[in-house]
Interface confidence: low
């Protein structure tokens, strides 16, 4: 075994924007740190066989399997996958090691299996075996976190029953409104499951794993805040835990808080209280109302009362299954070329939705903002004044919702022309959709004022790529106009554009645009 080469097998995971992945299998661009796959000699095998550790890959991920060979002289190689031979081009790195790579772009089921690499060096022949499988993300879940009280402690535990186990973090903020956005300096994150500091203004718990990030906010009534004109509303599904926090600050201890459901005191075991001094020696009290697993009869108005503050209520609604409430009728908008405009969808949903905006088969991130009245709103402003069809799609665990928007940009027509042996056609995507005229240019009409009405066919077509309407006009060629210049003009309320076409024989035509 003295002459056996030193073999190193590595896996390189590429980020999925493809920019880091080489298109040729010989020189992949390595942007991520390689993972050592071991490559141990397989015992009791005929010939010299090295086996790499099994590789599990996400669907659509891009990877490189790479072998580094420390052996003198040249090497030749061959990849075999599912009985097919694949080209193999070894090269040498700076340490003079032979490097053999196999790039798998956008992993699919058909690319899973055993990859055999046969290497022939001056001293010996050997085989390297890689087993590549697709990670079973069907088993993956990411569930919204929920809260539990820690036994015998004034603390909340955040739980997310997800696979793989998520990283749980508390997101805390002590200021009001806009300044509690995730990126704000007022926001503090704590990567732990248990939270003792329960007096903050805004408390959320987030769980994240390979599938993304889900957050749950601790629903709070603050008796020192002016009550909203509409009651805050909290939706829950049957079986979920209910947590509501009532918070109040007073100059001294001389006040208490109570929770009532529909004017009846909450049952024992369904509340607990905490209090603390704030820096200016005022007293902060919080009273939690909780139900470990809600039923339909837990629906109702929950009122938090204090001996020193006005009472405030929240409407808790328990539903059998989730919902998305919004009007799904399609909406058409007509705007000027430089007009500021955003699409918006107002909806009420539980659980919180995941959403996307789509235009021309391209998806854009979707942001949601909660309104005071229990509704949420999603806006899309990044249309860059491109006319066409925009789609808002939202879904949660139980419901789906799609809404279509059409954006028309008011602009003067732009005319494009093409011609064949038998006809000439002009196209325009101006809006409002233009009307057409054809004119013949001749000795009698050097300014092209002689109108052509025969053989003209106008139509409106939907350019599917952008979902925008294109108007076209086609002139069938007759002997009367062959060899002449003709002019097609598109006009709407914003202006006119024309193209001049020489009708002679098939082939490239000279087009003269005159606006």
């Amino acid at each position: 075994n003295q002459d056996l080469p030193v073999i190193k097998c590595v896996l390189i995971n590429h980020k999925n924007n493809d920019s880091s992945v080489g298109k040729s299998s010989s020189y992949p661009m390595v942007s991520e740190s390689p993972e050592d796959l071991g490559c141990a000699l397989r015992p009791q095998s005929s010939g010299t066989v090295y086996e790499a550790a099994a590789v599990e890959v996400d669907v659509s991920a891009s990877i490189t399997l790479q072998v580094l060979v420390d052996a003198p002289g040249n090497i030749s190689c061959l990849w075999v996958f599912k009985h097919s031979s694949l080209n193999c081009q070894p090269h040498f790195d700076l340490q003079n090691r032979g490097v053999v790579s196999m790039v798998i772009l956008k992993m699919t089921e058909t690319q899973a299996g055993e990859y055999l690499l046969f290497i022939q060096s001056e001293a010996t022949n050997y085989t390297i075996l890689f087993t590549v499988s697709i990670r079973n993300t069907l088993l993956y879940t990411l569930r919204r976190p929920y809260f539990r009280k820690m036994e015998n402690q004034d603390a909340l535990v955040c739980i997310s029953e997800s696979v793989p186990e998520p990283i749980v973090e508390w997101v805390l903020c002590d200021s009001q409104g806009e300044s509690c956005k995730e990126e704000s300096p007022a926001v503090v994150k704590k990567e732990e499951k248990v939270l003792h500091e329960l007096f903050g203004t805004d408390i959320r718990c987030c769980a994240r794993n390979e599938l993304g990030r889900e957050c749950t906010r601790l629903f709070t009534i603050d008796l020192n805040q002016t009550p909203q004109t509409t009651l805050p509303q909290l939706f829950l599904k049957v079986g979920e835990p209910l947590w509501i926090r009532c918070k109040a600050v007073h100059v001294n201890h001389g006040f208490g808080l109570t929770w009532e459901l529909e004017n009846k005191a909450l049952e024992e075991g369904n509340y607990f209280e905490m209090s603390t001094y704030s820096t200016n020696r005022t007293m902060i009290r919080i009273l939690f109302a909780f139900v470990s697993s809600v039923a339909r009869n837990d629906t109702g108005y929950y009122t938090c009362s204090s001996s020193k503050h006005p009472s405030q209520s929240a409407l808790v609604t328990i539903v059998e299954k989730g919902f998305i409430n919004a009007t799904n009728s399609s909406e058409d908008y007509e705007i000027d070329q430089y007009e500021e405009f955003c699409f918006s969808v107002r909806f009420k949903a539980y659980p919180q939705i995941r959403c996307t905006w789509t235009f021309s088969r391209k998806s854009f991130p979707c942001e949601q903002k909660g309104l005071d009245n229990g509704y949420s709103i999603s806006k899309f402003c990044n249309h860059k004044h491109q006319p066409g069809e925009y789609i808002f799609h939202a879904e949660n665990d139980d419901a789906q919702f799609t809404k279509m928007f059409t954006l028309n940009i008011r602009r003067k027509p732009q005319v494009l022309a093409e011609a064949s042996a038998s006809q000439a056609s002009c196209f325009s995507d101006g809006y409002p959709l233009p009307s057409w005229t054809w004119k013949k240019c001749s000795d009698k009409s050097p300014n092209c004022t002689e109108e052509i009405t025969e053989g003209v066919w106008n139509r409106k077509a939907n350019r599917k790529v952008f979902g925008q309407w294109v108007s076209s006009s086609t002139l069938n060629m007759s002997e009367a106009i062959k060899g002449f210049l003709v002019k097609c003009c598109a006009y709407n309320s914003l202006g006119t554009s024309c193209e001049t076409i020489l009708l002679n024989s098939p082939g490239p035509f000279p087009f003269i645009q005159d606006n």
Partner: nanobody, 111 residues
């Protein structure tokens, strides 16, 4: 519904100690904070001390050192140990959980 019953009050001489008890019915005793308050004749009710569910204590600054609050979760009872009593400690003493109050127990300090 939580019910609270104070006991242990009485007439004592200045400088004497006294221990008040607050017995609570209801399974949520251990989960909640307990406050002691007092109300002297013709005055507003004032806060005296508090013990949290975790056993942390807070006191009205002027009483700290003389008064000690404690709790026995197994007995669903809270205590207020008052030492070196003064005539100005004369008041009806109340215990409070959440927004539930006991009937009060009279403490009179007089020579």
């Amino acid at each position: 519904q939580v019910q609270l019953q104070e006991s242990g009050g009485g007439l004592v001489q200045p400088g004497d100690p006294l221990r008040l008890s607050c017995a609570a019915s209801g399974s949520t005793f251990s989960r909640n904070y307990i406050d002691w308050y007092r109300q002297a004749p013709g005055k507003q009710r004032e806060w005296v001390a508090q013990i949290t569910s975790g056993g942390n204590t807070h006191y009205e600054p002027s009483l700290k050192g003389r008064f000690t609050i404690s709790r026995d979760n197994a007995k669903n009872t809270a205590y207020l140990q008052m030492n070196s009593l003064k005539p100005e400690d004369t008041a009806v003493y109340y215990c409070r959980i959440l927004d539930y109050w006991g009937q009060g127990t009279q403490v009179t300090v007089s020579s």
